[in-house]
């Protein structure tokens, strides 16, 4: 008799990352009998929801259902119907919703209420929608990249199956850049974490980890740009802002009401004698860098060492994975190669920012102007944040690995979140049996 293929015994999970600028839906898959093994969960789909982040729906919450439809229907197609009822769905909202909650807890709850109502209409097993903390965002990002890099596996291998693998069990640090916040998370070397708020203790697969993490709210790339504009318009002599962070020849009108809409610009708010101003790009990396540095208060530190704004940061240790906008921006600028030194990155940024806007538009005809116009700022901001904010140096730059995906799964907090909420990261090392019963047919 011929051997019949057994139906694969797999499970699925869905996580929606409700970020400040957009929402993405991730579908994960894993073998049911290997739930506690490390490295078995992988991403099978990413669906980017068309439109802005959910916090922008605060005045039109009735549109959230339509907004989520395409990606939820995609999930319905990808996941076999027999698995729908068993598939958990989680939604985690990050700094965009943290900012909305700071303005109004009621409005933030209204958005999440409508999200739940919308997601409960699908055949999946909806588990909850919530605003995750900055600490969680950092921690889950760290768990994701180390899980995917095989750092929690006790088996040492003589061959490398993943990029960046140094065949030791030393974990990677995680650098995450979003639109509204940025996170830094790593295991410091024998260093006391001086501020309790930044300390996390994990026991994963039988090993203890003392992890440092901090999330800088308002220091994501979009909110940092709003901060910079609010700071610079204070000293503008009229309604023209000559801005070194935009290409020469670039022009854009900004409403003052939009500028002061976010809590991130409150510290720079003042009564201006105009309702609008015009950004005129002058494309100068050095001046842009200097302007960005003014967003980081380094004059005050109540600890042995700080990042900025009086936040404790231990000495950097080991290799780091830089993902999300760190990766997207550097990838666009073609600066993700391991061979590119920090000096070379700076040189390339100087050239890029100095290129005239008309030339840039021609060179990148397929890219939306809104995004295209901001790469000079974003690239400069990334350099400023990593070098002056987090104290990377020209030498330690080579320890930063700009990572989009690891083994087909996106680097980011969502996988770590799902692993935790589905209890798929055991505290103790699972007992390994020579052959699991599933081996026998």
């Amino acid at each position: 008799t011929q051997n019949k293929a057994l139906p694969e015994n797999v499970k699925y999970g869905i996580v929606l990352d409700a970020g400040s600028s957009h929402t993405s839906l991730y579908i994960y898959k894993w073998p049911a009998e290997k739930e506690n093994d490390t490295g078995v969960v992988h991403q099978v789909e990413e669906c980017r929801v068309k439109g802005p982040g959910i916090s922008k729906f605060v005045q039109k919450v009735n549109e959230i259902g339509i907004y989520l439809t395409d990606c939820m229907e995609r999930a319905r197609e990808v996941i076999p119907r027999s698995q729908h009822q068993e598939t958990p769905v989680y939604l985690g909202a990050t700094a965009g919703m943290r900012l909305l909650r700071m303005e109004s807890e009621e409005l933030a709850d209204r958005v999440l209420d409508v999200v739940e109502r919308s997601l409960s209409n699908y055949p999946f097993d909806f588990q909850g929608a919530r605003i995750i903390t900055g600490q969680e965002e950092g921690a889950y990002g760290w768990i994701t990249i180390n899980y995917l890099l095989g750092k929690f596996s006790q088996k040492t291998r003589w061959f490398s199956i993943v990029p960046y693998e140094t065949n030791n069990q030393e974990t990677f640090g995680a650098l995450d850049l979003g639109g509204a916040s940025t996170q830094v998370t790593f295991v410091p070397q024998n260093q006391t974490i001086e501020s309790p708020d930044n300390a996390l203790q994990f026991r994963l697969y039988g090993k203890d980890y003392n992890v440092y993490t901090h999330s800088f709210l308002c220091y994501g790339k979009d909110q940092a740009l709003w901060q910079k504009l609010a700071k610079d318009i204070q000293v503008a002599s009229n309604e023209i802002l000559r801005d070194p962070c935009f290409h020469p020849g670039y022009k854009k009108v900004v409403n003052v009401s939009d500028l002061y809409k976010t809590p991130c610009t409150k510290r720079f708010e003042m009564t201006l004698p105009f309702q609008q101003f015009e950004i005129q790009g002058i494309g100068n990396y050095q001046q842009c860098h200097q302007s960005i540095l003014e967003l980081f208060n380094t004059s005050y530190c109540p600890y042995s060492q700080c990042a900025f704004n009086g936040i404790f940061l231990p000495p950097l240790q080991g290799d780091f994975g830089a993902f999300s906008a760190f990766y997207f921006v550097m990838k666009f600028l073609n600066l993700t190669s391991e061979k590119v030194s920090q000096e070379k990155v700076t040189e390339m940024m100087k050239k890029f920012c100095a290129q005239p806007w008309e030339e840039i538009k021609t060179s990148y005809a397929g890219v939306k102007e809104k995004y295209l116009s901001e790469y000079c700022f974003s690239g400069t901001y990334i350099l400023s944040l990593l070098l002056q904010g987090y104290h990377f140096t020209a030498d330690s730059w080579e320890h930063i690995h700009f990572i989009g995906k690891i083994q087909g799964s996106d680097a980011g907090w969502t996988l770590g979140y799902m692993l935790n909420l589905t209890n798929m990261i055991p505290a103790e090392q699972p007992l390994s049996t020579p052959l699991s019963h599933s081996t026998y047919v």
């Epitope: 097993d125 588990q127 909850g128």
Partner: nanobody
Framework: EVQLLESGGGLVQPGGSLRLSCTVS????????MGWFRQAPGQERDFVTA????????HYADSVKGRFTISRDNSKNTVYLQMNSLKPEDTAVYYC???????????????????WGQGTQVTVSS
């Protein structure tokens, strides 16, 4: 961890009504699915009903469908169980339950990590 405090139990005649309340302290209330379970003397603890964080998903045990209604008021951190057409077989200790980022369906299966209240006695007798 969240703490749960039930109230509203008591003695009621068959066919009567009762409303149980459960107030939650600590934690972000909307992040928890809430439920009610009951345990009659000498029996196991049974699922009665559960509701999702913002109240859009509910599940009921077949034995109470159409008679019991679960609801929640997130502004008061409170979940309610309205019990109508009570029968002697509804007599039990009723326990409030909270489960973080867990669906009502999983609560029904008693899956995941559940935090329990102390329980309140409901007696249906003439």
């Amino acid at each position: 961890e969240v703490q749960l405090l039930e109230s509203g139990g008591g003695l009621v005649q068959p066919g009567g009504s009762l409303r149980l309340s459960c107030t939650v302290s600590r934690g972000t209330f909307s992040e928890y699915s809430m439920g009610w379970f009951r345990q009659a003397p000498g029996q196991e603890r049974d699922f009665v009903t559960a509701i999702s964080g913002f109240g859009h998903i509910t599940h009921y045990a077949d034995s109470v469908k159409g008679r019991f209604t679960i609801s929640r008021d997130n502004s008061k951190n409170t979940v309610y169980l309205q019990m109508n057409s009570l029968k002697p077989e509804d007599t039990a200790v009723y326990y409030c339950a909270a489960a973080w980022q867990t669906s009502p369906r999983r609560m029904m299966q008693m899956a995941g990590s559940i935090t329990w209240g102390q329980g309140t006695q409901v007696t249906v007798s003439s």
